[in-house]
Interface confidence: low
């Protein structure tokens, strides 16, 4: 036998009280999906959240954060207080990169500049605390009757790269 | 809700080349980092290469560093991995990942199956 | 590039029971400025990865708290304190140190 409730589409549920009728989902509350026995209550942007767009019968809320704030968590479910670049934020507040490391976003992490040498290549620019430093050609490709030198790739150390 | 798209499973000849697309959605491309990593069959994943939030800049393993090239396209929200001379090795699942605000590849794209086979 | 150890390659863990996997890096992970440059992934099957633990210890956005990362420098373990069904899969550690490398992978699975 087919479920009634699998008739009623997103936006309403299914009334038990009212003999399985699909009803509209009340005021602040959405249902996504059909057949819904119940309406679930929509998110509702406080404080230092602000409303990205507004809940419907059938759609939940989205909330972004107040200028100076950033989204942090799935669906933004924490806004995290923006820095400068050149610095990151602990729990003290924002705090200056320390001497290596690099931070060219207003949020996230200092990360370590890129170790040019690693890759066989030298500094061209050094690192500051907003920008990481720019590794330029080996010293191979310096040596006198080398070919034209190509531009230095981009640099730093991948993976929990500057934001 | 923020998730990453990849373009579907390819067949491909050795000698030739693949791209593999990837579209963000829920989120602005340009904010964080996407790194493409790939993984052969029963193998641990390998890092291939990634461009940087703002610029675009890219780095590429040095195992890669000839025959990939990472782009985007951020009015459409979607980036790119490119892998020339394809050879049987290539044979595996490429992944688009995003590197979250305090690191860690916190999204993942459903991954594209590459085969090469003459 | 940093190579990464993992033990064991194989977990049979019964429900309800703890369980315990451990990296070990070629170099320290530990940078000057206080991060240890290790994430933890679990890969379901036929799934993506996914991300558990973050920077060694942090754990990511919806990771029950059932899972816990620790360690510094050379040696990390993950621990999880009661296995569940939906936790079987193959478990990556992975440095970020220097260029990206992943752990050959733990494979729990439920005895």
């Known amino acids: 036998l087919q479920d009634p409730c699998s008739n009623c589409p997103a936006g309403t549920f299914c009334d038990n009280n009212r003999n399985q009728i699909c009803s509209p989902c009340p005021p602040n509350s959405f249902s996504s999906a059909g057949g819904q026995r119940t309406c679930d209550i929509c998110r509702q942007c406080k404080g230092v959240f602000r409303t990205r767009k507004e809940c419907s019968s059938t759609s939940n809320a989205e909330c972004d954060c107040t200028p100076g704030f950033h989204c942090l968590g799935a669906g933004c479910s924490m806004c995290e207080q923006d820095c400068k670049q050149g610095q990151e934020l602990t729990k003290k507040g924002c705090k200056d990169c320390c001497f290596g490391t690099f931070n060219d976003q207003k949020r996230g992490i200092c990360r370590p500049w890129t170790n040019c040498s690693l890759d066989g290549k030298s500094v061209l620019v050094n690192g500051t605390k907003e920008r990481d430093v720019v590794c330029g050609p080996s010293p191979a490709d310096l040596s006198p009757g080398a070919s034209s030198v190509t531009p230095p790739a981009p640099a730093r150390e991948p993976g929990h790269s500057p934001q | 809700q923020v998730q990453l798209v990849q373009s579907g499973a390819e067949v491909k000849k050795p000698g030739a080349s693949v791209k593999v697309s990837c579209k963000a959605s829920?989120?602005?491309?340009?904010?964080?980092?996407m790194h493409w990593v790939r993984q052969a069959p029963g193998q641990r994943p390998e890092w291939m290469g990634w461009s940087n939030a703002g610029n675009g800049n890219t780095k590429y393993s040095q195992e890669f560093q000839d025959r990939v090239t990472i782009t985007r396209d951020t009015s459409a929200s979607t980036a790119y991995m490119e892998l020339s001379s394809l050879r049987s090795e290539d044979m595996a699942v490429y992944y688009c990942t995003r590197e979250g605000v305090t690191g860690g590849f916190d999204i993942w794209g459903q991954g594209t199956m590459v085969t090469v086979s003459s | 590039d940093i190579v990464m150890t993992q033990s064991p390659l194989s977990l049979p863990v019964t429900p309800g029971e703890p369980a315990s996997i451990s990296c070990r890096s070629s170099q320290s992970l530990l940078h000057s400025i206080g991060y240890n440059y290790l994430d933890w992934y679990l890969q379901k099957p036929g799934q993506s990865p996914q991300l558990l633990i973050f920077l060694g210890s942090n754990r990511a956005s919806g990771v029950p708290d059932r899972f816990s990362g620790s360690g510094s420098g050379t040696d990390f373990t993950l621990k999880i304190s009661r296995v569940e069904a939906e936790d079987v899969g193959v478990y990556y550690c992975m440095q970020a140190l220097q260029t990206v490398t992943f752990g050959q992978g733990t494979r729990l699975e439920i005895k």
């Open positions: 829920g989120y602005t491309l340009t904010n964080y980092p």
